[in-house]
């Protein structure tokens, strides 16, 4: 059986998680991909999820997530601002391709984050620049961030405008340092 | 649109072991998505049973899980339920769904429903 | 196992009032990393399944009048039907999907006062 790897991310409240979730490029670049997190005994929970199909370069939010897919390094870039000890806990980039299993990135992220000044810049304060957010959805799609008819499989959303609103406007830039420890099960 | 029938028999004995199943219409099993049952007795509220995934995946409800399985069939489009040991507190409307939990986290659509009767 | 606790049980309401519902989570039900509240609200009327009005505690399904309203956050909601009419005359569940088991409240049934 594939031994399953994760990658310890060891943070601040306040700071940014960005991990980097590599893919073959030739295979999935234009698949929709999401930023899942899987709690002991539940069922992983889609937290965020690309466009289908997946556009190349183009950020998308989701609360304190980002999410963006370059096509050209077949990579899928997620960062967490602002993080919370609460968000603490397991992770993994999938990448969506009905009807075959969602296909896990490896590896797995462990995230653990803890109280405490981060001493570096942290991702909640004010920011002149773009903030991408996800339009408003009305109808339910299997990765469930965008408007698309549940009967429909392939449907992308019409547009994915440039939206700020009040809550978690948030810096784009600052990402902090990591420690990366790579842990095996 | 995506379309769920519930089906199997309304009496079921004592002791005995209560099979359902649901039809999916309108959407492939295969193409995602969690599939669950839920069962209402009468007059009652609601309680989820357990939910899969159409790899087999499963989740159940603690209070049932000794007594429930739950399995799918991609090839008919359809997943099942079975609870052995039935007793008359097993007696209820059991209705079948597509389970959001890790999506939007809802259950949408709901089939009819079908009554089964637990009774000698 | 999260409890969730709706009030009242019952409530009767005059044509084009507001209906208040309630549901209280033992535990929070918000991700906050997505900002989203696993919390839906059902309607369902006697001899059919219930039927999905409210998810993310907030969104209203498709097809739903707008006189359905959902609010609140991490522990605390309410379903509100700012205008009831005749056919708004149900039982009213709410369901977290936050942590299985999936759980839902006792259900609120509402009347024509």
């Known amino acids: 059986a594939t031994k399953l790897t994760e990658e310890k991310y060891e943070l601040k409240e306040g700071q940014t998680l960005d991990v980097k979730c590599d893919y073959t490029l030739e295979k999935f670049a234009s698949s929709q991909k999401a930023w899942q997190i899987i709690r002991d005994g539940e069922m992983p929970k889609t937290l965020a999820c690309t466009e289908r199909p997946s556009k190349n370069s183009h950020p998308v939010q989701v609360g304190r997530i980002i999410l963006e897919d370059y096509h050209d390094h077949g990579l899928l870039r997620v960062r967490m601002v602002n993080l919370q000890v609460e968000d603490s806990g397991l992770y993994q980039c999938v990448i969506y391709q009905p009807p075959k299993e969602p296909h896990m990135l490896f590896d797995r992220i462990r995230l653990v984050v803890t109280k405490g000044f981060s001493g570096t810049p942290g991702s909640n304060e004010n920011s002149t620049q773009n903030v991408y957010k996800i339009p408003p959805t009305t109808t339910k799609a299997l990765c469930p961030l965008y408007t698309s008819p549940r009967t429909v499989t392939q449907a992308p959303p019409k547009s994915t405008a440039d939206v700020s609103t009040p809550d978690s406007e948030i810096n784009l830039t600052n990402v902090t340092d990591i420690i990366r420890v790579p842990v095996f099960n | 649109q995506v379309q769920l029938q519930e089906s199997g028999p309304g009496l079921v004995k004592p002791s005995e072991t209560l099979s359902l199943t649901c039809a999916v219409s309108?959407?492939?099993?295969?193409?995602?998505?969690?599939w669950a049952w839920i069962r209402q007795p009468p007059g009652k509220g609601l309680e989820w049973i357990g939910s899969?995934?159409?790899?087999?995946?499963?989740y159940y409800n603690p209070s049932l899980k000794s007594r429930v399985t739950i399995s799918v069939d991609t090839s008919k489009n359809q997943f099942s339920l079975k609870l052995s040991s039935v007793t008359a507190a097993d007696t209820a409307v059991y209705y079948c769904?597509?389970?959001?939990?890790?999506?939007?986290?809802?259950?949408?659509?709901w089939g009819q429903g079908t009554l089964v009767t637990v009774s000698s | 196992d999260i409890v969730m606790t709706q009030s009242p049980d019952s409530l009767a309401v005059s044509l084009g009032e507001r209906a208040t519902i309630n549901c209280k989570s033992s535990?929070?039900?918000?991700?906050?990393?997505?900002?989203?509240?696993?919390l839906a609200w059902y309607q369902q009327k006697p001899g059919q399944p219930p039927k999905l009005l409210i998810y993310?505690?907030?969104t209203r399904e498709s097809g739903v009048p707008d006189r359905f309203s959902g609010s609140g956050s991490g522990t605390d909601f309410t379903l509100t039907i700012s205008s009831l009419q005749a056919e708004d005359v149900a039982v009213y569940y709410c369901?977290?999907?936050?942590?299985?088991?999936?759980?839902f409240g006792g259900g609120t049934k509402v009347e024509i006062k």
């Open positions: 369901q977290q999907l936050a942590f299985t088991p999936w759980t």
């Open positions: 993310w505690a907030s």
């Open positions: 535990q929070s039900v918000l991700f906050s990393s997505n900002n989203k509240n696993y």
């Open positions: 899969i995934y159409h790899s087999g995946s499963t």
């Open positions: 309108g959407y492939s099993i295969s193409s995602g998505y969690y």
């Open positions: 769904a597509r389970d959001l939990g890790g999506y939007e986290g809802a259950f949408d659509p």
